[in-house]
């Protein structure tokens, strides 16, 4: 049987009286081994026959003395089997063996949990020679024990290629509970139950857990470690911790904050990065996420023109990268822009609205009803048209660009004319007779040149022909009309 040494047990601070796992009353030691060092050692208990060699792992020497008497089997003497002490206390324990003097170079090594202890340990071996035998005492001391010193210690000695092994000495370092799992911060949905876990170990066991929420004890009766607390739901942020109690006292975990998920705050600092005629690139700074990751954002765009119908265009985008290009806008228009983002709980309010404008663009349509006719008397070609609708001018008209291409007998020549925005007619000189003139017109703004109208062709005869009816822009679906005069 393993014998035990133990420090005086202190009563459980919260639960006096018998309870599961309580320490038994200490026994008076049968034998207290002396120690030269100055620290207060743990008490050590030895069996009733301290000097009796054990029959475990023994070496029977083959050498005999002069009288030819066989030598007794070699074995470590029994010593204390179990030492219980508090963290940071000192401890010293030993192995002893009597070895016949015929054996030379006997060394004792210390092993812990199957691994040899080398180097920075306080192991001392003392030899006490006598006429026939030498008593060897190997001492092992630890000045300030830690939990990592817990374990089973043995001595080993090699003689005659035989290994002699001592009985184990179990060291049990007791202290305040040590957390192996503490509650963790969480973000939770309002009024929804969730779990927190707390686990602590001794020795000594048992370790009992109390939960604390906002400084109030949740469970007035302890729960054995590990403990899972089901929190029935929160309406506001709370701080939780757990207390771990054992016979040595209590340890308190870190306090963790449990936040309640909420809708996000509105984005801030919505700003214009770039504007074109039909798009605006915006960026924003997200608001507080409400303890729940953003999922996506919504850009709301409404025309700032007081005469507009006030309809809102909505563009959805991912929450990152806080940047969005709003497309399909009208040129030279004013818009109010707001941004809202959502998490799993819901949508934020809309950011403060900002005003933004698109720039001028090139017109999106060509001039309408283009007609061309030959004024032979002045040797000119007259061109007339209607300006594009204001909505589709995409800016302020600064004029028109007229392209006229002259083709005859394998020769082709394109000329461009710029005319001012006033009026809707132009006159160009005949460049070549007996040729086809193809005319196209585009509207021009500061934003650029719009599309050209469909081509209108007119044949310019040789000199002396009569001025006939004009050519005009065809109806949709008709291919290049040619009026031959």
């Amino acid at each position: 049987a393993i014998t035990e040494a133990r420090e005086e047990a202190k009563p459980y601070p919260l639960f006096p009286g018998p309870f599961p796992g309580s320490l038994q009353t200490d026994h008076t030691p049968l034998l207290s081994l002396p120690h030269a060092s100055g620290y207060q050692p743990a008490l050590m208990f030895s069996p009733t026959q301290p000097g009796r060699p054990h029959t475990g792992n023994v070496a029977i020497p083959q050498v005999t003395s002069v009288e030819s008497k066989p030598l007794p089997p070699l074995a470590f003497k029994h010593t204390v089997g179990h030492i219980i002490l508090s963290e940071h206390k000192g401890v010293k324990f030993n192995c002893s063996i009597s070895v016949p003097n015929i054996y030379q170079d006997t060394t004792i090594s210390w092993w812990k949990d199957g691994k040899e202890l080398l180097g920075a340990h306080h192991a001392i071996t003392q030899f006490y020679p006598d006429d026939e035998v030498t008593a060897i005492i190997a001492s092992f001391s630890i000045t300030s024990v830690q939990r990592s010193d817990n374990g089973s210690y043995i001595c080993k000695m090699k003689i005659n290629n035989e290994e002699i092994v001592s009985d184990p000495i179990y060291i049990e370092v007791q202290g305040l509970p040590h957390f192996t799992k503490q509650p963790e911060s969480m973000n939770v949905t309002r009024n929804t139950a969730f779990n927190l876990t707390c686990q602590a170990v001794g020795p000594p066991e048992p370790v009992n857990i109390f939960w604390v929420q906002n400084s109030s004890r949740v469970n007035e009766q302890p729960e054995k470690s590990p403990s899972v607390l089901t929190v029935p739901g929160l309406t506001e942020m709370a701080v939780f911790s757990c207390e771990a109690h054992n016979d040595k006292g209590l340890t308190v975990s870190k306090g963790v904050q449990i936040n309640i998920k909420a809708i996000p705050s509105p984005p801030t600092e919505v700003s214009i990065r770039n504007s074109t005629a039909h798009s605006i690139l915006i960026s924003w700074v997200p608001g507080f996420d409400g303890y729940s990751p953003f999922r996506n954002c919504s850009i709301q765009v409404k025309e700032a023109d007081p005469l507009s119908n006030g309809s809102v265009m909505i563009f959805n985008t991912s929450a990152l990268p806080h940047l969005y290009q709003i497309k399909q806008l009208q040129a030279l228009a004013n818009y109010s822009i707001g941004v809202s983002c959502m998490n799993e709980i819901g949508w934020s309010a809309v950011s403060p609205w900002i005003l933004a404008s698109t720039t001028e663009g090139a017109p999106s349509v060509a001039p309408l009803n283009v007609t061309v006719f030959l004024n032979e008397s002045s040797d000119n070609v007259d061109i007339r048209w209607m300006k594009p609708p204001t909505k589709q001018q995409d800016g302020e008209l600064v004029g028109y660009r007229i392209s006229h291409v002259w083709q005859s007998a394998g020769i082709s020549k394109e000329l461009l004319e710029e005319v001012g925005q006033n009026g809707s007619r132009a006159r160009i000189s005949v460049q070549v007779h007996n040729a086809t003139c193809t005319v196209r017109i585009a509207a021009v703004t500061r934003g650029g040149v719009g599309p050209f109208s469909d081509p209108v062709k007119i044949f310019i005869p040789a000199h002396g022909w009569v001025d006939y009816a004009p050519s005009s822009t065809p109806a949709p679906g008709n291919a290049d009309p040619v009026l031959i005069i």
């Epitope: 639960f15 009024n191 906002n214 109030s216 949740v218 009766q221 029935p232 709370a238």
Partner: antibody
């Protein structure tokens, strides 16, 4: 199923003592605390305190310190309330209630009427 | 000690009515529990931790609130709901009960 069964009604003279029992069944007795609640005739509920069934340690509220004693016999899963030096104003129904996390009294005994009258 | 004040103390209502009982705490509490007591019977847990229905309690009962203000609502009164209702706080020892609200048939 969880049950708390209390002892029957008591009629006592002033100055006497009474001991009310509360026997628990349907759960592990030592895992939940036991509270005692008083209800005077026509009045509301008053929490008297509780006993830790794990350690046997009682806790009393200020109004119930002195003449009131909570005790246990864990072998028979029973809690006791003893009142000594009874007064007329101790006349009330006394309830035991199982006491869980967050101070919830989730199961109640049927109540014991203690009448103190000369 | 934290004082709990229930209002109203008496309430007359008819079957099918929606009724709300309020419990106000003298200082902030963590949770409020609600109990129902019928004459000559022990109290019965109705709602725990402000808004959680106890086992077997019909869904017409609901609870809400935080801090110092809490409510118990019965969405559509049934004949078996006529009783006295008590609130009880958790968050500060000693635990205290409200004075009760007696719900009577109109």
């Amino acid at each position: 199923q969880v049950q708390l069964v209390q002892s029957g009604s008591e009629l006592k003279k002033p100055g006497a003592s009474v001991k009310v029992s509360c026997k628990a069944s349907g759960y592990i007795f030592t895992t939940y605390g036991l509270s005692w609640v008083r209800q005077a005739p026509g009045q509301g509920l008053e929490w008297m305190g509780w006993i830790n069934t794990y350690s046997g340690v009682p806790t009393y509220t200020d109004d119930f310190k002195g003449r009131f004693v909570f005790s246990l016999d864990t072998n028979v899963s029973t809690a006791y309330l003893q009142i000594s030096s009874l007064k007329a104003e101790d006349t009330a129904v006394y309830y035991c209630a199982r006491y869980t996390n967050y101070g919830v009294f989730d199961y109640w005994g049927q109540g014991t009427l203690v009448t103190v009258s000369s | 000690d934290i004082q709990l004040t229930q209002s109203p103390s008496f309430l007359s209502a008819s079957v099918g009515d929606r009724v709300t009982i309020t419990c106000r705490a003298s200082s902030s509490v963590g949770y409020m529990h609600w109990y129902q007591q019928k004459p000559g019977k022990a109290p019965k847990l109705l709602i725990y931790a402000t808004s959680n229905l106890a086992q077997g309690v019909p869904s017409r009962f609901s609870g809400s609130g935080s801090g110092t203000g809490f409510t118990l609502t019965i969405s559509s009164l049934q004949p078996e709901d006529f009783a006295t209702y008590y609130c009880q706080q958790w968050g500060s020892l000693p635990f205290t009960f409200g004075q009760g609200t007696k719900l009577e048939i109109k």
